[in-house]
Structures are given as C-alpha cells and as structure tokens.
C-alpha cells in the first residue's frame, strides 16, 4: 500500500501461452511486494472482430498508471493488445474497454467456472 | 544489500563445455527468477533463457536449445548456466540477472558477468 | 520471435541536452517493455519497467513512454554520467529481445 509495509495481493492468473512460456495456464496468483511498493491485478487480450482472446492475467509491479483503479478498464482506442489494470484483490476477474475518444463500452465477463477437483 | 555474484573468466577450447555460477545474497532466492543473458563483443545483449528457483520450470531461446541448461541449487542461493559444445561465436561476456515473478518481468538486478572466451 | 527496433543507433548530445530514443516492436506488446543502461565493461542497469514506470533509484530525468509498439526513452536534461548506451526490451513473450542499442556519445 505504499505507507512503510510490504502489500499482498490476490489476482486471477492466466496465461495463454503457458506450454511454450512453461507456467501454469490459469489459477489464483498471489502476489507478495517489496516494503513501500503497490501491487496490482491486470488483464490483456485482443479483439478479433468482436470475439474476445485472453492473453495475460496477473500480478502487475508497482505502476503508477494503475494507482487507484478500482475496476480493470482499458482506455486505448485500437490496440493490438488490450490492457488493463486495477487495485484490489480479483479485480481482474472482469475487464472492461472504454476507450477515452468516447463509443460503446465492453465489458467482458469470465466465464462460469466448474468447481475444481482436488484428488 | 541485494546482489548477484558470478564465477571468475573462463578460456575454453571448441567442443569443450562451461558452466558459470551465480550466487544471490539479499533476497528471497526462491521468490525470485534468474535470466541469462550474454553479449559477444562489441555486440548487442542476447537473452538466453529463464529459470525459476521456485520449481525449476525452465524457458531457453531456441537456438541455444539442446546445448545450454540452466539449474539452481537453492540450499546455496546459487544459478548455474552450462553451455555445451563451445563455438568460437559464443565468446562473450555471460550475465545473470534477477528477473520478478509478476508482470511485466523486469530484470532489475544483474552479476557484474562472466568473461567466456572460446580459442583454439 | 518479436524484433525490436530501435533508433538512432548514436546520438551526439551535449550535457544539458534533452535526447529521445525510440523503440519500436514488430507486433504488439502492450506494455510489457523495459529500457536499460550500460556503461562499457559494466553490467545493464534498470531504468524504465512497464514502459513508463521508473525504476527505485533512478534519477527523475529519466523517463519512458508509449504502449503497443511504439516507445520512447527520454532525458529531460542529460548530465555526465548519462553517456551510455542504452537498450530496450520486451518481455511480452518468449523468447525476450532486445534492441540493438542506443549509444550516446558526447558531441
């Protein structure tokens, strides 16, 4: 939180390209700063024609962009790469584009997910 | 204070291989990755792969793949890179570097590097 | 793999001077970029993570910029110890690259 004590955070993990890059593909990371520094959550993807690719979720180091945003929304007009990031914990969990030249606001939902299975 | 230690300069002949160390003081060594990468002379930098302490998960550039790997001993704080069948283009100067688990993966700390001259 | 491409490859400046260096990636990388400083026979330094945040301890005149696939380092008033040369590098996807580097002389 930036006022003397190391910050822990919580954000939804996801990575598309997990097999090449050797990660996990999706999940829970917890993040865990430096004294004096903020954590964020994040989320990018892209826009083909209207249907939403996820690319990255996750922890983002301290970024003064990202300062007091409570909900994960992406400014950018047309980007190759949607980004966003917030404050909070699972505040990445949905995503939003509301580009600052104005028109329709997008707001992505996760879809539901089935209860994991712990064998 | 937080830093990375790197093995003395090594002269090898082609063929042979090298294995340059690492050791992190400062940290939580395991909370962290370790990237290499390396810089011929008067050239450019060159990633050469990512290890994390943590689990062991490895990630190598693909021309280097078959020939380098990169290993941690964690009771020591201490990466390792070995590089196989030296050639006289991987000549250069070998750094590791300390690189954030979370986006977007700076590489915020480095070794002062490793000289790896490969001469017949 | 993703080129970055950086310009100029040298730059003369004068102490004082404002000099901007630019990077440009071959697709989008958002910004997931860094800019580093090396001095000959010493390792890179980290100036710049996430495009435009500034890493601890170094100096304010330091500043990035940009998102996509287009970035810019800037030095608001280059001092002495700033000739150096300069990379920047993506960390968006595997394999990381760099540019080829920036070195900035003193004119």
């Known amino acids: 939180s930036g006022r003397g004590e190391a910050e822990t955070r919580e954000c939804i993990y996801y990575n598309a390209n997990w097999e090449l890059e050797r990660t996990n593909q999706s999940g829970l990371e917890r993040c865990e700063g430096e004294q004096d520094k903020r954590l964020h959550c994040y989320a990018s993807w892209r826009n083909s024609s209207g249907t939403i690719e996820l690319v990255k979720k996750g922890c983002w180091l301290d970024d003064f962009n990202c300062y007091d945003r409570q909900e994960c929304v992406a400014t950018e007009e047309n980007p190759q790469v949607y980004f966003c990031c917030c404050e909070g914990n699972f505040c990445n969990e949905r995503f939003t584009h509301l580009p600052e030249a104005g028109g329709p606001e997008v707001t992505y939902e996760p879809p539901p997910t089935a209860p994991t299975l712990l064998t | 204070q937080v830093q990375l230690v790197q093995s003395g300069a090594e002269v090898k002949k082609p063929g042979a291989s090298v294995k340059v160390s690492c050791k992190a003081s400062?940290?939580?060594?395991?909370?962290?990755?370790i990237s290499w990468v390396r810089q011929a002379p008067g050239q450019g930098l060159e990633w050469m792969g990512w290890?994390?302490?943590?689990?062991?998960?490895?990630n190598y550039a693909q021309k280097l793949q078959g020939r380098v790997t990169m290993t941690t001993d964690t009771s020591t704080s201490t990466a390792y890179m070995e590089l196989r069948s030296l050639r006289s283009d991987d000549t250069a100067v070998y750094y590791c570097?300390?690189?954030?688990?979370?986006?977007?993966?700076?590489?915020?700390?480095w070794g002062q590097g490793t000289t790896v001259t490969v001469s017949s | 793999d993703i080129q970055m491409t950086q310009s100029p490859s040298s730059v003369s400046a004068s102490v004082g001077d404002r000099v901007t260096i630019t990077c440009r990636a071959s697709?989008?990388?958002?910004?997931?970029l860094a800019w580093y400083q090396q001095k000959p026979g010493k390792a890179p330094k980290l100036l710049i993570y996430?495009?435009?945040s500034l890493q601890s301890g170094v100096p304010s005149r330091f500043s990035g910029s940009g998102s996509g696939t287009d970035f810019t380092l800037t030095i608001s008033s280059l001092q002495p110890e700033d000739f150096a040369t300069y990379y920047c590098?993506?960390?968006?996807?595997?394999?990381?690259?760099f540019g080829g580097g920036t070195k900035v002389e003193i004119k």
């Open positions: 590098q993506q960390a968006f996807s595997h394999p990381w690259t």
């Open positions: 570097a300390r690189v954030s688990m979370y986006a977007p993966e700076p590489m915020d700390v």
């Open positions: 996430a495009a435009s």
């Open positions: 400062g940290y939580t060594f395991t909370s962290y990755g």
């Open positions: 697709q989008g990388i958002s910004r997931w």
């Open positions: 290890i994390s302490p943590y689990n062991g998960n490895t």
